[in-house]
């Protein structure tokens, strides 16, 4: 049975086996085509989601689709139902929390009262002044809190208490990539992790431990990537894995927050990386223990210089490392989070690519998560 499962796939009607390598090869080898059903699927970027959250205290902004202008949501008459609608528009199914926060002196958007129309937030037509003088601060999911705060040092062994959102993504029980829990159903990782194996069956997620292989594996229902851009093959290195059953959150299994749409991190901002990847370039072996390291944002201009990536780092990517080199993500860390701590931890990047590991002029290159928020929300909405 185990040998059969490893090398063959059972087609139905009529029942017969086909070699497993024929799964997800673009050819219908089973009469009903089920060999092409449970495969990595691509999902287009989709339309602009008409709500977003700002780094200014997680305040809610709403798009006026007629003009293309964004407005801040006034707290006047804002209800739990409106909060749920806003979060559902971003694909969340959990119960949101919201509160009033004072309109700040730097408020640059017009403030409008919000209403609902066919399950979408709208601006109230006859919106007068914002009487409460407050904006809506909205949290769609409790995220980004860990039991333990890491110490700021170079590279050290990590505890799952510090990084309860970190998962190991495994194919045939072998660790391939890292990933981050975003909510009970969804894990964020890199698309390039699935380049070799596009069948969903053999992929598993392991959560809740800092040791490789010491925790139960979770079945995967779907793997979704963004459409490939043949003009920038390294762009769009992002994937969402939908778990077959929702996770139960605990001290060691928790979600990390998505970044705010306007999360622009300046050079030298401190960030963290974690993973079970190679500890040396071409080091040949994964680390059994989760490792963590502090790095910093490296300016894109510097990263694109002639002695570095020569313009290959696009606006949808970011660089992080340390100026003198030596601390970096490496093979096996791919898909894992690049993290920033404000009030909560946010996954601002996904370990994507780089030349070598830890070189001074070629730091790690990460998928910039804020560039893909729209895509993430559209995927989630489609799967609600």
């Amino acid at each position: 049975k185990v040998i059969l499962d490893k090398y063959y796939f059972l087609c139905g009607q009529p029942l017969h086996f086909i070699p497993r390598k024929q799964l997800c090869d673009g050819e219908l080898d089973c009469p009903l085509g089920e060999d092409e059903e449970h495969c990595v699927k691509s999902f287009p970027e989709g339309p602009a989601v008409a709500v977003r959250l700002s780094k200014d205290r997680s305040t809610l902004q709403v798009l006026d689709s007629a003009t293309g202008n964004w407005f801040s949501a006034c707290f006047d008459n804002f209800t739990e139902a409106l909060a749920e609608t806003a979060c559902r528009q971003m694909g969340y199914s959990s119960k949101p929390t919201f509160r009033a926060v004072e309109i700040g002196p730097d408020q640059d958007l017009d403030v409008v009262e919000i209403t609902e129309n066919s399950q979408e937030l709208r601006m109230r037509n006859s919106s007068g002044p914002c009487l409460s003088g407050s904006l809506v601060s909205l949290h769609c999911l409790a995220c980004g809190k860990s039991l333990k705060t890491p110490r700021v040092v170079g590279v050290e062994e990590a505890s799952v208490d510090s990084w309860p959102w970190q998962v190991s993504i495994q194919y045939d029980k072998q660790h391939v990539c890292g990933g981050s829990i975003l909510d009970p159903h969804w894990v964020l990782t890199a698309a390039h992790c699935f380049r070799k194996h596009t069948d969903v069956f053999n992929w598993k997620v392991r959560a809740g431990s800092d040791k490789l292989g010491s925790f139960p594996s979770l079945a995967v229902a779907k793997i979704i990537i963004i459409e490939f851009n043949p003009m920038y093959p390294k762009d769009n290195d992002i994937a969402l894995m939908k778990l077959q059953f929702p996770l139960t959150f605990s001290g060691t299994v928790r979600p990390i927050c998505l970044p705010f749409f306007d999360e622009e991190l300046t050079p030298a901002t401190p960030l963290w990386i974690i993973g079970w990847g190679f500890t040396k370039q071409n080091g040949g072996k994964m680390s059994d223990i989760l490792l963590q390291a502090s790095v910093q944002v490296i300016d894109s201009t510097r990263c694109n210089a002639d002695d570095a990536y020569q313009g290959e780092v696009t606006e949808k990517m970011m660089c992080a490392g340390i100026p003198e080199g030596g601390v970096d993500t490496c093979q096996g860390d791919s898909g894992g989070p690049l993290m920033y701590q404000s009030d909560q931890w946010h996954v601002v990047g996904i370990v994507s690519w780089g030349y070598g590991c830890g070189g001074p002029s070629t730091p790690g290159v990460y998928t910039k998560v804020s560039a893909y928020l729209n895509w993430i929300y559209n995927v989630w909405k489609a799967e609600l």
């Epitope: 970027e45 459409e227 490939f228 851009n229 043949p230 003009m231 920038y232 093959p233 020569q310 313009g311 290959e312 696009t314 606006e315």
Partner: antibody, heavy 117, light 107 residues
Framework: QVQLVQSGAEVKKPGASVKVSCKAS????????IHWVRQAPGQGLEWMGW????????GYAQKFQGRVTMTRDTSTSTVYMELSSLRSEDTAVYYC??????????WGQGTLVTVSS | DIQMTQSPSSLSASVGDRVTITCRAS??????LNWYQQKPGKAPKLLIY???RLQSGVPSRFSGSGSGTDFTLTISSLQPEDFATYYC?????????FGQGTKLEIK
């Protein structure tokens, strides 16, 4: 220096196929994607598809899906583009081009394919 | 597919003139835009990538600007060898698409 050298001009009958080659030199062949772009006489540029010489992966423009096939031979650093079921509208200069940073930095000299009965 | 529209379609200018060609995308493409120059019987030549980055070996009189939907190619002081057809091309989303071209002729 980097060069992409294409095969010579071809005259084909409607319904036939044509296979254009593009030989790369002066750089690591497997490190850069190759794209194909065509230009009908007096017209603009039209993208046809891409190939990764490293993995052999390909992708084609919707318009050419089912009619175009791109292959490569790593031993000779050559990429091929085959277009089948030719019609008169396929008369054009066909270019291969190397992709760098989202743009085509080196182009072949072009291959004129004439489809005529 | 993303449509790219260039203006003008043709343009007459003299040596030494400052020339501007514009390109508009049917939707936002950030700065994922390239400019090419093509002379009769020759393959196109990459001038500008990522909207404003000058390709190696291209004279500094060529410059590109813009982001989102509106882009500009500027030649600060036309030289005799600059008379050619210019194409913009978006690389934001597949399939990559080209503008219809702007023919720059001697006045």
């Amino acid at each position: 220096q980097v060069q992409l050298v294409q095969s010579g001009a071809e005259v084909k009958k409607p319904g036939a196929s044509v296979k254009v080659s593009c030989k790369a030199s002066g750089y690591t062949f497997t490190s850069y994607y190759i794209h194909w772009v065509r230009q009908a006489p007096g017209q603009g540029l039209e993208w046809m598809g891409w190939m990764s010489p490293n993995s052999g992966d390909t992708g084609y423009a919707q318009k050419f899906q089912g009619r175009v096939t791109m292959t490569r031979d790593t031993s000779t650093s050559t990429v091929y583009m085959e277009l089948s079921s030719l019609r008169s509208e396929d008369t054009a200069v066909y270019y291969c081009a190397r992709l760098v940073r989202g743009g085509f930095d080196y182009w072949g000299q072009g291959t004129l394919v004439t489809v005529s009965s | 597919d993303i449509q790219m529209t260039q203006s003008p379609s043709s343009l007459s200018a003299s040596v030494g003139d400052r020339v501007t060609i514009t390109c508009r995308a049917s939707q936002g493409i950030s700065s994922y835009l390239n400019w090419y120059q093509q002379k009769p019987g020759k393959a196109p030549k990459l001038l500008i990538y990522a909207a404003s980055r000058l390709q190696s070996g291209v004279p500094s009189r060529f410059s590109g600007s813009g982001s989102g939907t509106d882009f500009t190619l500027t030649i600060s002081s036309l030289q005799p060898e600059d008379f050619a057809t210019y194409y913009c091309q978006q690389s934001y989303r597949s399939p990559p698409t080209f503008g219809q071209g702007t023919k720059l002729e001697i006045k």
